[in-house]
């Protein structure tokens, strides 16, 4: 039996179709293709005869198709008028015709789509952020990529206004990174340049590792000791020191040479993230003896959180 | 006292390279990041990059990448910037300064400045 | 790169007058901004960090203020030792940028 196959059945605009026929019959002399579900000759495309390979064109020819001897027929640079149903006939020697009809959707091409934001430097844990993909465009689905891999499911994602828009609620530090939208019709699909999502956060309650000599929690009069300090913050927060309430200097490392019973006291570090508006800090008392006992670093320390 | 010492000034060629130091004293060579800053006469100030002296990373500036070179030799308490294939527009003066703190701090100690003149 | 625009580019003023310079950040700096001084042929000095925030020995009237993308230096009263050219700069990470400096000048 005759049937018609369109390769591809969903045609993006511009692109071009192919009307492929197959089990042709063995007696024919030529063929009709028309517009629409039924032989008119106000419809006919382009008639064909095989003995003299010559094409003819009909009222309904725009000069975008071509007929091939296999009845096959191309039509490039397609329109979404072009939607809907094509019929063949093909004349056979007994004049007893056959005929076919096939059908293609034609959708428009996808422009790139955008992504604008409301926020792309939230702070966590305070701010919102909301994605919107644009421009809108009808019968289009939308997707959303996050560095790479489709939406993970979480309470904290919303997405709305037919997925165009994405909602971040309460940004987390692990929200940050690559977003792009993507649009897409039957036929085609089209994705959005990235954009980088910066979340704002810490700085956290530091941490002090006793880098010290000799080793331990021990400190012994004469000992280098080495307090080295890190708070998890975006931007990398401002790191202080205060032994003894005394503003000291404004390094991660706080370096003493050659200790003394002179240095006990409580050794704060202080962190601070202007971006986010917040500051923390860790508070360890050190005890140096003058001989061979050895006491040490209060390792239960004070933990000062501020907004 | 915080001190940064820079060598001396320096008239070079166009197409030559010119290696300037800067020598810190008065505090923990290794705990504060250094930079440079260069002013060409009558002009503004222009950052150039900076190097870690505790690691050696350094990050230059856009401009002078591929131009620029910084090291730090920690036995002596220096470091060095080179800047190769000079032109004209190089004539400046060339700061050393010390970052006030670890991270997002401005610069709180300078060289007093080695003037490169590049001249044929 | 972040963009930083400082005006006037000069000014002129009598001694004791309050006098005030502006930046601008192409970018939010959250805070992150410094003022350096430099008076002529002499190597900058910093004045004020963290957009407020005074150097130690920096007399008091000088004060720094301003958030997000505009900043003020304010001097409350000008004395002649504070002719020199003022520049801003933004600290929050590299690449630095500096702003093309403010020239103060007495009447």
């Known amino acids: 039996k005759l049937t018609i196959e369109s390769t591809p059945f969903n045609v993006a605009e511009g692109k071009e179709v192919l009307l492929l026929a197959h089990n042709l019959p063995q007696n024919r002399i030529g063929y009709s293709w028309y517009k629409g579900e039924r032989v008119d000759g106000n419809s006919l495309i382009v008639g064909y005869v095989i003995g003299t390979q010559q094409a003819t064109p009909g009222p309904a020819y725009s000069g975008r198709e071509t007929i091939y001897p296999n009845a096959s027929l191309l039509i490039q640079n397609v329109t979404q008028n072009d939607t809907g149903f094509y019929t063949l006939q093909v004349i056979k020697s007994d004049l007893v015709n056959e005929e076919a009809t096939g059908q293609f959707h034609v959708y428009p091409e996808l422009p790139k789509p955008s992504i604008s934001s409301n926020n792309s430097n939230p702070v966590e844990d305070k701010d919102a952020v909301a994605f919107t993909c644009e421009p809108e465009v009808q019968n289009t689905t939308y997707l959303w990529w996050v560095n790479g891999q489709s939406l993970p499911v979480s309470p904290r994602l919303q997405l709305s206004n037919g997925n165009m828009t994405l909602t971040l609620l309460s940004v987390k530090r692990n929200d940050a990174g690559s977003y792009e939208c993507e649009i897409q019709n039957p036929a085609s699909a089209n994705r959005s340049d990235p954009v980088t999502l910066n979340v704002l956060y810490g700085p956290d309650v530091p941490t002090i590792s006793p880098i010290i000599s000799p080793p331990d929690s021990s400190y012994l009069s004469g000992a280098n000791l080495n307090l080295s300090c890190h708070s998890a913050s975006n931007p990398s927060p401002q790191y202080s020191w205060r032994i003894n309430g005394i503003p000291q200097q404004h390094t991660q490392v706080l370096f003493i040479a050659k200790i003394t019973p002179n240095n006990n006291g409580t050794y704060a570090c202080f962190v601070s993230n202007l971006a986010t508006g917040r500051n923390n800090s860790i508070v360890k008392s050190i005890t140096v003896s003058a001989s061979g006992t050895s006491p040490g670093l209060s390792a239960g320390a004070h933990h000062h959180h501020h907004h | 006292q915080v001190q940064l010492v820079q060598s001396g000034a320096e008239v070079k060629k166009p197409g030559a390279s010119v290696k300037v130091s800067c020598k810190a004293s008065g505090y923990i060579f290794t705990s504060y990041y250094l930079h440079w800053v260069r002013q060409a006469p009558g002009q503004g100030l222009e950052w150039i990059g900076y190097i870690n002296p505790q690691t050696g990373y350094t990050s230059y500036a856009q401009k002078f990448q591929g131009r620029v070179t910084m090291t730090r030799d920690t036995s002596t308490s220096t470091v060095y910037m080179e800047l190769s294939s000079l032109r004209s527009e190089d004539t400046a003066v060339y700061y050393c300064?010390?970052?006030?703190?670890?991270?997002?701090?401005?610069?709180?100690?300078w060289g007093q400045g080695t003037l490169v003149t590049v001249s044929s | 790169d972040i963009q930083m625009t400082q005006s006037p580019s000069s000014l002129s003023a009598s001694v004791g007058d309050r006098v005030t310079i502006t930046c601008r950040a192409s970018?939010?700096?959250?805070?992150?901004l410094a003022w350096y001084q430099q008076k002529p042929g002499k190597v900058p000095k910093l004045l004020i960090y963290n957009t407020k925030n005074l150097v130690e020995g920096v007399p008091s009237r000088f004060s720094g203020s301003g958030s997000g993308t505009d900043f003020t230096l304010t001097i409350s009263s000008l004395q002649p030792e504070d002719v020199a050219t003022y520049y801003c700069q933004h600290h929050l990470g590299t690449p630095y940028t500096f702003g093309q400096g403010t020239k103060v000048e007495i009447k």
């Open positions: 970018e939010n700096q959250y805070g992150y």
């Open positions: 300064a010390r970052e006030y703190g670890n991270y997002n701090y401005p610069l709180d100690y």
